[in-house]
């Protein structure tokens, strides 16, 4: 058959959730402490909660069923009787009070025909307002009747007919009536909730809904340029072109700011957007979502998006709407012709309307975005540039900050990139130029996105002229080649002169993309004395295990997941894996990861790495190469403490400094 | 055949010198790192100091470090051991001992020792 | 440095039975690149220079005989001599090339019971 509707599917779960009572016993689930009931999906009955409150479970007879005394469930069919009978039925006895006042409804209801009557539940009427309740019954109760009518259409309407956005033709004056059929299985009538539904009659259908519904007459435009509330609202529309849309056809919901609302904005962040028509038309489009939303149908936490493209958290709690978890909805369900109005006392500045100093303000940077305040880059997080703000996360500084000085003020700047970025149009092997004057290469691995060392850490905040990327650490730029680096350190003094010795000098400051697990003067020393005068008495084994150091990609830590297979200049592949923020090549600890360089990274290790396949075997006829003499002059690995002649005297001293 | 054959041992007084040498022949001397190992009399075995193929790496046990100096002469297919400040733990049978190849490894071939008495 | 501690120091065994001797470094001879066990085992008689039997904890020297063996993995190491002969009775030393300074046990010696 056809697919079922939202309401169907719903009623469905309550049934089998209701079954082990008994046949056609549905579950309920009541609000405790108020009379708010409702079937139940899947999710609400696991966490036994309906706008964060606690419910309870109760059993009830399923719609048109009936119990028997000494049986189990509701096995009997409710007898059919007519309209008027059948609104008894369902507990809707006001109304049937209402429609004997009237005088001509009741024969109607008890004539022939068919109808489909909304009718509101006890509760609903005691809660209108003593002057509304007046008015209704004065004069000569046309007033009621019309009210009555507007709650009818003049056939028989089943839910599976009831479609989201549909309009039914009521029997007052032809008014329409609005529907909205949510994918939760609420269904209501001008936002007014279909309690208990499809109640047959002989002469049509009985739909309980939990409020009085009234005719609407104003679109969306009017109702904002009637109400003294959104005075600035009003302004801020017609100074956007939008009042052309909130006055045409659709079905919108305006969580329209009130005056109060704008007025909590500081007074430069307003006149700035004000302003500024694009930022205008973002921050009112980011007011108004595509669809007519009303209150009843939020029962838990929803996403929606909004004209702007911004996603909000609609939800509740008790009976408060909250947006984004605030319960800024102070009135709702205001209906107009082509949408619904919820008034809300705090403005939703939307990403696109902010500078980058407010972006900041709402992430988890602040520490950053004071360090460039006090290096004097303020004025380009809050101008009208095109940039990108590379911010690290607070927890970068947990150690502290660095002091503001030349140094800490260029690398701020180059933090800063010259062009607004959106990061899902970045690619690897893209150079971006920094205020600094540096070019920063992009990286893409499989799990991240990485600008040098540093990696995007959340999604990309993009702002009116700037776009905030959050990254998981300070960003080094490279300052020389993977030899330079090696080279201006003094950890690798061996290391170089290996690299020296087996002719790899070239290959690491030629451009290039390169992994280098670069070994200190420790891990050299640690090698077993065989091992080592292994590597120094053989050129092609010493260039090997070095080759086997490089890896052919550049790879730092951010890009790594949980486990990456580098391959080596040598041939084989390293593995390189992340556990517990530590990186490890070949299940040994890296001791400093991400020191970049313009032709690759250096990862310092402690340990030499042996190549699987060129593990040493021992053979006693082999032949080695001759001896490496630049190597050996600058190596660590003698203990000795007089020398040769042939050593020359800086060599000489660094011998003494590495000796055992 | 390997052949390692020590002179110059003999008896000495505290702080004095002696020179040791290791003549070898049978192999080609040059390719092999060589070491001094002594014995104590009546103990076990003490490694005393290594030199590399090409005479560049050389390492001393602590107890000889800055006393003892390790040297070979690759064209007298010659090993040497010049030892000053002598102390009387440093009587001993000292042996000049052949690695396993080119590189540094275990010790293969030995000669038959030469002894030194340190005494007043 | 490496501690390399033999035991027992007096082994007494009849000729044609079975001799073993153990050895305990004081850390690990097993490099993990390589996955040898960087340990050698020396005989010494009286008066003369010591020989090498065994390298690599199990690799036995050219003219070796197959009697000699030797076993063991990172800290504990045996040799075996499965047979023993006349020429067999003399001091057995392990020693471990895998840091400086190299060391030596202080040698187990084997008697004729």
């Known amino acids: 058959g056809p697919a079922k509707s939202p309401y169907q599917l719903v009623l469905q779960h309550s049934r089998l959730r209701g079954r082990q009572h008994g046949p056609n016993v549905c579950a309920v689930q009541k609000v405790i402490g108020t009379n708010r009931k409702y079937f139940t999906n899947c999710k609400q009955w696991y966490q036994r909660k309906i706008c964060g409150k606690s419910t309870v479970i109760s059993y009830e007879c399923c719609p048109g069923y009936e119990k028997v005394p000494g049986e189990k469930g509701c096995p009997a069919a409710l007898p059919l009787s007519n309209l008027y009978e059948t609104l008894g039925v369902v507990g809707s006895t006001t109304t049937q009070l209402y429609t004997d006042r009237t005088e001509k409804l009741r024969p109607e209801m008890e004539g022939p025909g068919s109808f489909t009557i909304f009718a509101p539940s006890n509760e609903a009427w005691a809660s209108l307002p003593a002057e509304v309740l007046d008015s209704l019954v004065s004069n000569v109760n046309i007033e009621l009747l019309n009210a009555l009518r507007y709650h009818m259409v003049g056939r028989r309407v089943l839910t599976d007919e009831l479609k989201h956005g549909m309009t039914l033709t009521s029997m007052y004056q032809n008014s329409n009536i609005q529907i909205h059929h949510y994918p939760n299985g609420i269904v209501t009538v001008n936002c007014a909730r279909l309690l208990k539904a499809d109640h047959h009659a002989t002469n049509g259908v009985v739909h309980l809904i939990d409020k009085v519904i009234s005719t609407i007459t104003n679109n969306i435009q009017q109702i904002i340029e009637i109400e003294d509330t959104f005075e600035t609202l009003r302004a801020a529309v017609a100074a956007s072109g939008l009042n052309t849309m909130l006055e045409g056809n659709g079905q919108y919901t305006l969580l329209a700011p009130t005056n109060e609302a704008f007025e909590k904005i500081p007074s430069e962040t307003l006149n700035r957007i004000l302003g500024d028509p694009e930022a205008l038309r973002d921050l009112l489009n980011n007011h108004i979502l595509k669809s007519a939303m009303c209150a009843e149908a939020i029962v838990a936490g929803l996403s929606v998006e909004t004209l702007e493209g911004t996603t909000l958290e609609v939800g509740c709690s008790g009976d408060m709407l909250t947006i984004n978890g605030k319960a800024i909805i102070s009135n709702k369900d205001i209906l107009a012709t082509n949408g619904v109005i919820h008034y809300i006392d705090e403005l939703l500045i939307p990403d696109s309307a902010k500078t980058l100093f407010e972006l900041a303000a709402e992430s988890d940077v602040s520490t950053a975005i004071d360090l460039f305040r006090q290096a004097g880059l303020g004025n380009h997080l809050s101008g009208s540039e095109r940039l990108t703000l590379l911010a690290p996360l607070n927890s970068v500084f947990k150690d502290g900050t660095p002091p503001i000085d030349a140094h800490t003020r260029n690398l701020l700047r180059n933090h800063i990139i010259k062009d607004q970025l959106a990061s899902k149009y970045l690619y690897h092997g893209q150079t971006l130029e920094t205020l600094g004057g540096k070019k920063l290469r992009v990286f893409v691995y499989r799990n991240s996105l990485c600008i040098e060392n540093s990696c995007i850490a959340a999604h990309d905040k993009r702002g009116r002229y700037g776009t905030l990327f959050t990254m998981d650490r300070v960003l080094t730029p490279p300052m020389g080649t993977v030899m330079d680096v090696l080279k201006g350190d003094n950890r690798f003094s061996m290391l170089v002169a290996a690299i020296q010795s087996a002719g790899l000098t070239e290959t690491l400051n030629r451009e290039g993309v390169y992994t280098v697990f670069a070994p200190t003067n420790e891990a050299f020393r640690a090698l077993p004395p065989r091992e080592r005068s292994r590597l120094l008495g053989d050129a092609k084994e010493l260039a090997n295990i070095l080759k086997y150091h490089i890896g052919d990609e550049i790879l730092v830590s951010g890009g790594i997941g949980a486990l990456v297979r580098l391959k080596s200049l040598q041939g084989d592949k390293l593995e390189v894996s992340l556990k517990n923020n530590v990186v490890s090549v070949n299940k040994e600890p890296v001791a400093e990861p991400d020191i970049m360089a313009t032709n690759g990274v250096v990862h310092v290790i402690t340990n030499v790495l042996q190549p699987p396949a060129n593990r040493p075997q021992e053979r006693g006829d082999e032949l080695a190469d001759s001896a490496l003499e630049i190597f050996k002059q600058a190596s660590a690995f003698s203990r000795a403490s007089q020398r040769s002649v042939r050593l020359a005297p800086v060599y000489q001293k660094l011998l003494e400094r590495m000796k055992h | 055949q390997v052949q390692l054959v020590e002179s110059g041992g003999g008896l000495v007084k505290p702080g004095g010198s002696l020179r040791l040498s290791c003549a070898a022949s049978?192999?080609?001397?040059?390719?092999?790192?060589m070491y001094w190992i002594r014995q104590a009399p009546g103990k076990g075995l003490e490694w005393v100091a290594t030199i590399s193929d090409g005479g560049i790496y050389i390492y001393y046990a602590d107890s000889v470090k800055g006393r003892f100096t390790i040297s070979r002469d690759s064209a007298k297919n010659s090993l040497y051991l010049q030892m000053n400040s002598l102390r009387a733990e440093d009587t001993a049978v000292y042996y000049c001992v052949r690695g396993w190849d080119r590189y540094d490894s275990w010790f293969a071939c030995w000669g038959q020792g030469t002894t030194v008495t340190v005494s007043s | 440095e490496i501690v390399m501690t033999q035991s027992p120091a007096t082994l007494s065994v009849s000729p044609g039975e079975r001799a073993t001797m153990s050895c305990r470094a004081s850390q690990s001879l097993l490099y993990s690149s390589n996955q040898k066990n960087y340990l050698a085992w020396y005989q010494q008689k009286p008066g003369q220079a010591p020989r090498l039997l065994i390298y690599?904890?199990?690799t036995r020297e050219t003219g070796i005989p197959a009697r000699f063996s030797g076993s063991g993995s990172g800290t504990e190491f045996t040799l075996t001599i499965s047979s023993l002969q006349s020429e067999d009775f003399a001091v057995y030393y392990c020693q471990q090339y895998y840091r400086y300074p190299y060391t030596f046990g202080q040698g187990t010696k084997l008697e004729i019971k």
């Open positions: 049978g192999f080609t001397f040059s390719d092999y790192y």
């Open positions: 690599w904890a199990s």
